[in-house]
Interface confidence: medium
């Protein structure tokens, strides 16, 4: 049965774009208009979960890409990746729950909560060029984003 | 109060079809899947395939060379068609309805039909 | 196409804690679900998404599910309780449920 998907661009509240800086690891820096299209394009698809009001249940994938952003436990933190997945399995609509984040909309922004560690988010740090990761919404770090649609 | 009531055939003969319809009152018909499992008599329960409000369908594997689901939004209704069946067939013939507010899952289901086949 | 196992029967007297476990390959990725089923009638789901309760459905019930295996819990067993128990999870785009567990309320 066919999943639905939407294309965005990701930026965080400092307007930092998202980029890939090496197979499987994401960095958030400031981009000009010159390389403005490095940033990744994400395919956000409608997934199972527990959908609320302010809560949608997504995965995100990397456009043209087998990559979708996946929460684990490593070293007994919990951990933002980027795994690989076979292209004639995913998406679908019941994904792995470490793949599922809850989108939550707070006024003009957008956060995504790991479904399997609630309480953590995707961020991004105060600096450029740092990874993006998943933090528990602590310090300085930024998890409100901007998301500008794209046409598929 | 959402219901599901089902009806078709209860009594076959090997190698002809089973033919279903399940009847949706009440919620909308669009924004959900709609599946149908079987149980036969002291058995566990055997998913057969779903199909949403467009015609899209997903089998199970192995049922899937001999089962057709089909849909007809204009009555809010969904069908099961299952050819070639064999004793091995006899079972109660579930309807149910997925929803997202559950997680995707099957959280209303039709009475039931019992389906024999018997020569 | 994985498999989901249950224990054939369980039995626990009024007022105690019944567990009945559901375990399958990595079924902690997955979410669980669990259906209760009395005899002659539909199943009834009364946990989703591995511990979530569908509304009508009494606090005694509850899930957890983690590594291989998940549970389901109900505390304070009531006689109206004895019935079929059984789990499902999704595996390869296809549902797939447990071989059922036969509650037993003794008394």
């Known amino acids: 049965v066919p999943i639905r998907q939407l294309h965005y661009r990701l930026r965080d509240e400092q307007q930092k774009s998202l980029v890939l800086s090496d197979p499987y690891e994401l960095k958030a820096l400031h981009l000009n208009g010159q390389n403005i299209n490095q940033q990744v394009i994400f395919s956000m698809s409608f997934v199972q979960g527990e959908p609320s009001n302010d809560k949608i249940p997504v995965a995100l994938g990397l456009k043209g890409k087998n990559l979708y952003l996946s929460c684990v436990m490593k070293d007994g933190t919990p951990t933002l990746q980027l795994e690989s997945v076979d292209p004639k399995q995913y998406p679908k609509k019941k994904m792995e729950k470490r793949f599922v984040f809850n989108k939550i909309e707070v006024k003009s922004k957008v956060e995504f909560e790991s479904a399997e560690f609630p309480n953590w988010y995707i961020s991004t740090s105060q600096a450029e060029h740092k990874p993006v990761f998943l933090g528990n919404n602590s310090g300085q770090d930024i998890i409100d984003f901007t998301m500008e649609s794209v046409s598929s | 109060q959402v219901q599901l009531q089902q009806w078709g055939a209860g009594l076959l003969k090997p190698s002809e079809t089973l033919s279903l319809t399940c009847a949706v009152y009440g919620g909308s018909f669009s924004d959900y899947y709609w599946s149908w499992i079987r149980q036969p008599p002291g058995k566990g329960l055997e998913w057969i395939g779903e199909?949403?409000?467009?015609?899209?369908?997903n089998y199970n594997p192995s049922l899937k060379s001999r089962v057709t689901i089909s849909v007809d939004t204009s009555r809010n209704q969904f069908s099961l068609s299952l050819s070639s069946v064999t004793a091995a067939d006899t079972a109660v013939y579930y309807c149910?309805?997925?929803?997202?507010?559950?997680?995707?899952?099957?959280?209303?289901w039709g009475q039931g039909t019992l389906v024999t086949v018997s020569s | 196409q994985s498999v989901l196992t249950q224990p054939p029967s369980v039995s626990v007297s009024p007022g105690q804690t019944a567990s009945i476990t559901c375990s399958g390959d990595k079924l902690g990725d997955k979410f669980a679900f669990w259906y209760q089923q009395k005899p002659g009638q539909s199943p009834v789901l009364v946990i989703y998404?591995?511990?979530k309760r569908p509304s009508g459905i009494p606090e005694r019930f509850s899930g957890s599910n983690s590594g291989n295996t998940a549970t389901l819990t109900i505390s304070g067993t009531q006689a109206l309780d004895e019935a079929d128990y059984y789990c499902q999870a999704w595996d390869s785009n296809i549902e797939v449920f447990g071989g059922g567990t036969k509650l037993t309320v003794l008394g």
């Open positions: 199909i949403d409000h467009s015609g899209s369908t």
């Open positions: 149910a309805r997925a929803s997202p507010s559950s997680g995707w899952t099957l959280d209303y």
């Open positions: 998404l591995d511990n």
